[in-house]
């Protein structure tokens, strides 16, 4: 196997590799630095393996996966001692590396010249006490949201930031605004930002307006 790659968004984590097998199967093992290897996706002919259940046990650990190739009568795929060939993945630390999924604006509410914009706190597959944690539960204050907003009638964007899931911004009375948010983890060196949320504009169904 080669080109072992971690594909991970909001902790949903899949290991992918190449090539499509001919006359052999794959088994994947995953471990933290403890070296307690756990086998997954036994004797599969797929070229991907969902490792979410393992990495969510402790998202701050660093994981390594290895893909073993088991030949069907193909001696060249074993080492000299007859053990199966394997390849290691890159190291993967979910907390530092999982991609931030596209956020969603849950609602916005205008009261006079103030608008409160709320970002949906997405549920992850990370569990604590048999409950699925939200993105905010997992990242705490490491996670911020950036709000981009502009008057429907112009293109000049303003920004606001929050380390909660809510923004309270000043707007001009009588003007309609559009909003988009982005999740950011400023302390990261990779995968710092999500893609922007879908744009939501005042005057559409997600808004509430009070004088």
């Amino acid at each position: 196997a080669f080109n072992l790659t971690w594909i991970s968004t909001d902790f949903k984590t899949i290991l992918e590799w190449q090539p499509k097998p001919t006359n052999y199967t794959y088994t994947v093992q995953i471990s933290t630095k403890s070296g307690d290897w756990k086998s997954k996706c036994f004797y599969t002919t797929d070229t991907e393996c969902d490792l979410t259940d393992e990495i969510v046990k402790d998202v701050k650990q660093t994981y390594l996966a290895r893909v073993f190739s088991y030949p069907a009568g193909n001696v060249e795929s074993t080492g000299s001692a007859g053990e199966p060939l394997y390849e290691n993945s890159p190291e993967f630390t979910p907390y530092l590396e999982t991609n931030l999924g596209q956020p969603t604006i849950q609602s916005f509410e205008q009261v006079g010249t103030k608008v409160n914009v709320t970002v949906e706190d997405e549920r992850t597959l990370v569990r604590r006490n048999n409950t699925f944690l939200s993105l905010r539960d997992v990242f705490g204050k490491d996670l911020i949201y950036t709000l981009y907003y502009w008057k429907s009638s112009s293109s000049g964007k303003k920004t606001a930031k929050t380390n909660t899931n809510e923004f309270l911004i000043d707007v001009d009375k009588g003007e309609n605004y559009c909003f988009s948010v982005q999740a950011v983890i400023p302390s990261r060196t990779v995968n710092r930002k999500s893609t922007d949320s879908p744009v939501e504009c005042m005057g559409q169904e997600k808004g509430e307006f009070r004088e």
Epitope: K33, S34, G35, W37, Q61, G79, S80, A81, N88
Partner: antibody, heavy 118, light 107 residues
């Protein structure tokens, strides 16, 4: 800072026993596999044994299988090597090392000398 | 067992020199190779793992390369503190094995 401190070395007669200890600090001990490596006087390095973080998996070089036992006590942050039926060729400095994934050796202790002689 | 052969066994060089040490495995080990430095009467120190990944805190003048059976450790510009013995180690399969060492001496 990672610190590994070996103890328990000394002079022992052929056929005798010795138990080496390695006290670990500066990291979460149970999160790492650990290893013992030895070096005979004036010679190169020789891997002896490794153990996974849980203690469930152990590995040995052929020359010590059945004579040496690696173990760990995660509540005490301590690694052990029980050495029985010692031979003159086991004379060496024994190093304890942290071993991410049970692979390479990223931090080493200062070593303890075991001398097997009559 | 996988045999690891280092060359040369010893090497004389001067501060500022570029030095290369090679390590050959008796069978393919992919990139599962580490390099260590050892000074007299001291414990070894980890330099490189996964053939080319620099251990944290190790100066960037050290680099590793190779895959399969042939590997090299390069010191781009020798410093006085680099004179020591260097070992490679395979961790492809048990029993893990080391090269016999390369002693780097001052010319």
């Amino acid at each position: 800072e990672v610190q590994l401190l070996e103890s328990g070395g000394g002079l022992v007669q052929p056929g005798g026993s010795l138990r080496l200890s390695c006290a670990a600090s500066g990291f979460t001990f149970s999160n790492y596999a650990m290893s013992w490596v030895r070096q005979a006087p004036g010679k190169g390095l020789e891997w002896v044994s490794s153990i996974s973080g849980s203690g469930d998996y152990t590995y040995y070089t052929d020359s010590v299988k059945g004579r040496f036992t690696i173990s760990r006590d995660n509540s005490k942050n301590t690694l052990y090597l029980q050495m029985n039926s010692l031979r003159a060729e086991d004379t060496a400095v024994y190093y304890c090392a942290r071993s991410p994934w049970g692979y390479y050796l990223d931090s080493w202790g200062q070593g303890t000398l075991v001398t097997v002689s009559s | 067992d996988i045999q690891m052969t280092q060359s040369p066994p010893s090497l004389s060089a001067s501060a500022g020199d570029r030095v290369t040490i090679t390590c050959r495995a008796s069978q393919g080990i992919s990139s599962r190779l580490a390099w260590y430095q050892q000074k007299p009467e001291k414990a070894p120190k980890s330099l490189i793992y996964a053939a080319s990944s620099l251990q944290s805190g190790v100066p960037s003048r050290f680099s590793g390369s190779g895959s399969g059976t042939d590997f090299t450790l390069t010191i781009s510009s020798l410093q006085p503190e680099d004179f020591a013995t260097y070992y490679c180690q395979q961790y492809n399969s048990y029993p893990y094995t080391f090269g016999q060492g390369t002693k780097l001496e001052i010319k």
